[in-house]
């Protein structure tokens, strides 16, 4: 079953290569367990960046080596992606799945274009 997911169209990563955006879903019913996946689309290739399953009332827990962190509040998930470089510029898509209770719902956002600009190296000082 389909579900509407909203996310910002464009986000600019900061100078430390960190980008944050909100992924909001329109829950069609009660949801106590939610899975959030961030996908990156570039050159028609789609790769999974990170994923987390959380039970309502709990923080999102990504894998220890994940570049993502996040918090949840109601039907909103605040996602932060770290360690980005210019080559990581691309469309980052938020996918939300309502895992429990049934029925299963899934929604995919239109994507957030994240622009990453590598900082200029400091000029050597004489």
């Amino acid at each position: 079953k389909a579900m509407h997911v909203a996310q910002p169209a464009v986000v600019l990563a900061n100078s430390r290569g960190t980008a944050s955006f909100v992924c909001e879903y329109a829950s069609p019913g009660k949801a106590t367990e939610v899975r959030v996946t961030v996908l990156r689309q570039a050159d028609s290739q789609v790769t999974e960046v990170c994923a987390a399953t959380y039970m309502m009332g709990n923080e999102l827990t990504f894998l220890d080596d994940s570049i993502c962190t996040g918090t949840s509040s109601g039907n909103q998930v605040n996602l932060t992606i770290q360690g980005l470089r210019a080559m990581d510029t691309g469309l980052y898509i938020c996918k939300v799945e309502l895992m429990y209770p049934p029925p299963y719902y899934m929604g995919i956002g239109n994507g957030t274009q994240i622009y990453v600009i590598d900082p200029e190296p400091c000029p050597d000082s004489d």
């Epitope: 039970m55 309502m56 429990y100 209770p101």
Partner: antibody, heavy 119, light 113 residues
Framework: EVQLQQSGPVLVKPGASVKMSCKAS????????MNWVKQSHGKSLEWIGA????????SYNQKFKGKATLTVDKSSSTAYMELNSLTSEDSAVYYC????????????WGQGTSVTVSS | DIVMSQSPSSLTVSAGDKVTMSCKSS????????????LAWYQQKPWQPPKLLIY???TRESGVPDRFTGSGSGTDFTLTISSVQAEDLAVYYC?????????FGGGTKLEIK
């Protein structure tokens, strides 16, 4: 027929811990959340938390975080709740209650485990 | 957390009487996504675990006598027993089933004259 068989009453000293069990039968254990509910003598009901028996993920009432720990053993279709650093405030009857199969509200309950904390 | 308030705390009636008890929630239990009210009613007889009577504010659980009726929407809910029987002696609890943490009302104790 769904059945939730809870462990027997316990008498423990202040500061101790207790681990109670809830053995499920009559349904696929991993398909439905298991909730735990506290009822102090003559009082209302308090939801402690819930656990997904499939992967062991749990959610707690903030009031019981650090007090209760929920776990499951899929092989024996048993849910457990451990209570630590017990005080007289923890003296109560504790129920396990399964999410229902149609409406996912607590519709099957164990008979309760009575915990008395006394020196 | 959603606070559930029940009234009256107790009432004494005669067999055959009609009884109504109230439950109010501190925020709406009506889900905008599916227009369902996430409220349940439980009956707890002495020395027994709670038993589900009503879910979705108005749907009777299988096997529950039709003298039990749930009604209401949003924040105000009512449980009605059309003709009280001696076996209805119990405490009745409403429960927020909207989301975690689930919360219960303080209960209404029904006593029979």
């Amino acid at each position: 027929e769904v059945q939730l068989q809870q462990s027997g009453p316990v008498l423990v000293k202040p500061g101790a811990s207790v681990k109670m069990s809830c053995k499920a039968s009559g349904y696929t254990f991993t398909d439905y959340y298991m909730n735990w509910v506290k009822q102090s003598h003559g009082k209302s009901l308090e939801w402690i938390g819930a656990i997904n028996p499939d992967h062991g993920g749990s959610s707690y009432n903030q009031k019981f975080k650090g007090k209760a720990t929920l776990t499951v053993d899929k092989s024996s279709s048993t849910a457990y709740m451990e209570l630590n650093s017990l005080t007289s405030e923890d003296s109560a009857v504790y129920y396990c209650a399964r999410d229902g199969s149609i409406h996912y509200v607590m519709d099957d309950w164990g008979q309760g485990t009575s915990v008395t904390v006394s020196s | 957390d959603i606070v559930m308030s029940q009234s009256p705390s107790s009432l004494t009636v005669s067999a055959g009487d009609k009884v109504t008890m109230s439950c109010k929630s501190s925020q709406s239990l009506l889900h905008s996504g599916n227009q369902k009210n996430y409220l349940a009613w439980y009956q707890q007889k002495p020395w027994q675990p709670p038993k589900l009577l009503i879910y979705g504010a108005s749907t009777r659980e299988s096997g529950v006598p039709d003298r039990f009726t749930g009604s209401g929407s949003g924040t105000d809910f009512t449980l009605t027993i059309s003709s009280v029987q001696a076996e209805d002696l119990a405490v009745y609890y409403c429960q927020n089933d909207y989301g975690y943490p689930y919360t219960f009302g303080g209960g209404t104790k029904l006593e029979i004259k």
